[in-house]
């Protein structure tokens, strides 16, 4: 009989007015021995599931069902999965801010809506939260000595338009 | 040396109330979860209250639930059991023991620590 | 609730004897069992848990068995300072102790 709970293993639990090392009962744990208690094991339950199993020696690890995500250090909650038009924040799901769009259903973040102009392209069709903007095709600027190259669809040839 | 002992008890008339005390000694009564435990005279061992380590669950028998309230001071090392509209049938030895099941539980409890007992008589 | 029985209800024995008492659990109980010992005056002591895990400090002629709903104390070789009340205990659901086995000498 030992006279310390010093010498006890995590997965068991010690009490000093008894000091003997003690197997943690079922669905309880101790990663520290010679505590006086071993705690409660995590159980993922409702919209957690597991994903690490309770032992002795360490809690059980949930992570959330399908169409969920885990909110909080150690996955405390499950929240919905964000819908396109949102992005997962520390504080949960937030609408996309003006000018920003996530597409994806439950991941992704949002992302700045594309710049035409850069691409010197119009605006076909306004962005929105969940959807990009739709450029067009290229600004045509007329400015004095442009070529404009056209080759019909039919043949090799091309016609060279002058504009003045 | 490591110790519970139990105080308070004596003679009290039927619907009074009374107030016990167990004083842990020696080691952290604050560690474990705390029941009150009572022997009838010549009659067998119930269980009658428990107080989880810090205090933030309690269970009672049926028969004592509404009537009795168990706590706990840990800055006091101290347990207690407030008896209230006693009965005759209340009348027993009562004893502060420590659940030794080691889990932080509720209800799966056997008690390897036992104070020596105050007896409670309740009469006219 | 789970009703315990314990038989015999008294005992008597000799010095030496191996000496078996008995519990029985209305419910499956697994082995969620406790034994004690009171002595005359005094309080109880836990002797057994987990029904056949020894407590510290008590003498290995005192062991436990069984599992479920039947289960045995044995004192493999009786000693004087043995006399006793002996009492069992499930936890497995709620807490309810039988009602004593008296140990005796004859």
């Known amino acids: 009989v030992q006279n310390s709970c010093d010498n006890c293993q995590p997965g068991t639990f010690c009490r000093k007015y008894n000091p003997v090392c003690k197997s943690c009962p079922p669905s309880t744990f101790s990663s520290i021995g010679g505590q006086p208690n071993c705690n409660i094991c995590r159980v993922c339950a409702g919209y957690f599931r597991f994903k690490k199993f309770c032992s002795s020696t360490h809690n059980a690890e949930c992570e959330c069902i399908e169409g969920f995500h885990c909110l909080g250090p150690q996955c405390t909650r499950c929240e919905k999965d964000c819908r396109p038009g949102q992005e997962l924040t520390k504080q949960g799901c937030k609408t996309c801010s003006l000018g920003t769009f996530n597409d994806q259903n439950g991941t992704g973040v949002c992302r700045p809506w594309t710049n035409c102009s850069l691409d010197g392209r119009s605006v076909l069709k306004t962005g929105t939260t969940e959807k990009d903007v739709v450029c067009g095709p290229p600004v045509v600027s007329f400015s004095p000595s442009t070529t404009i190259s056209v080759t019909p669809e039919g043949g090799p040839g091309g016609h060279s338009l002058q504009v003045l | 040396e490591m110790q519970l002992v139990e105080s308070g008890g004596g003679l009290v008339q039927p619907g009074r109330s009374m107030k016990l005390s167990c004083a842990g000694s020696g080691f952290t009564l604050s560690d474990y979860g705390v029941a009150w435990v009572r022997q009838a005279p010549k009659k067998g061992l119930e269980w009658v209250a428990y107080i989880s380590y810090a205090g933030g669950t309690t269970y009672y028998r049926e028969s004592v639930k509404g009537r009795f309230t168990i706590s706990r001071d840990n800055a006091k090392s101290t347990l207690y059991l407030q008896m209230d509209s006693l009965r005759s049938e209340d009348t027993a030895t009562y004893y502060c023991?420590?659940?030794?099941?080691?889990?932080?539980?509720?209800?799966?409890?056997?008690?390897?620590?036992w104070g020596p007992g105050t007896m409670v008589t309740v009469s006219s | 609730d789970i009703q315990m029985t314990q038989s015999p209800s008294l005992l008597s024995a000799s010095v030496g004897d191996r000496v078996t008492l008995n519990c029985r659990t209305s419910q499956n109980v697994y082995k969620n069992l406790a034994w004690y010992q009171q002595k005359l005056g005094e309080a109880p002591k836990l002797l057994i848990y987990n029904a056949n895990s020894l407590q510290a400090g008590i003498p290995s002629r005192f062991s436990g068995s069984g599992s479920g709903t039947d289960f045995t104390l044995t004192i493999s070789s009786l000693q004087p300072e043995d006399v006793a009340t002996y009492f069992c205990?499930?936890?497995?659901?709620?807490?309810?102790f039988g009602a004593g086995t008296n140990l005796e000498l004859k």
């Open positions: 023991t420590i659940d030794g099941y080691g889990g932080y539980s509720g209800s799966h409890w056997y008690f390897d620590f």
């Open positions: 205990q499930q936890y497995y659901s709620g807490n309810t």
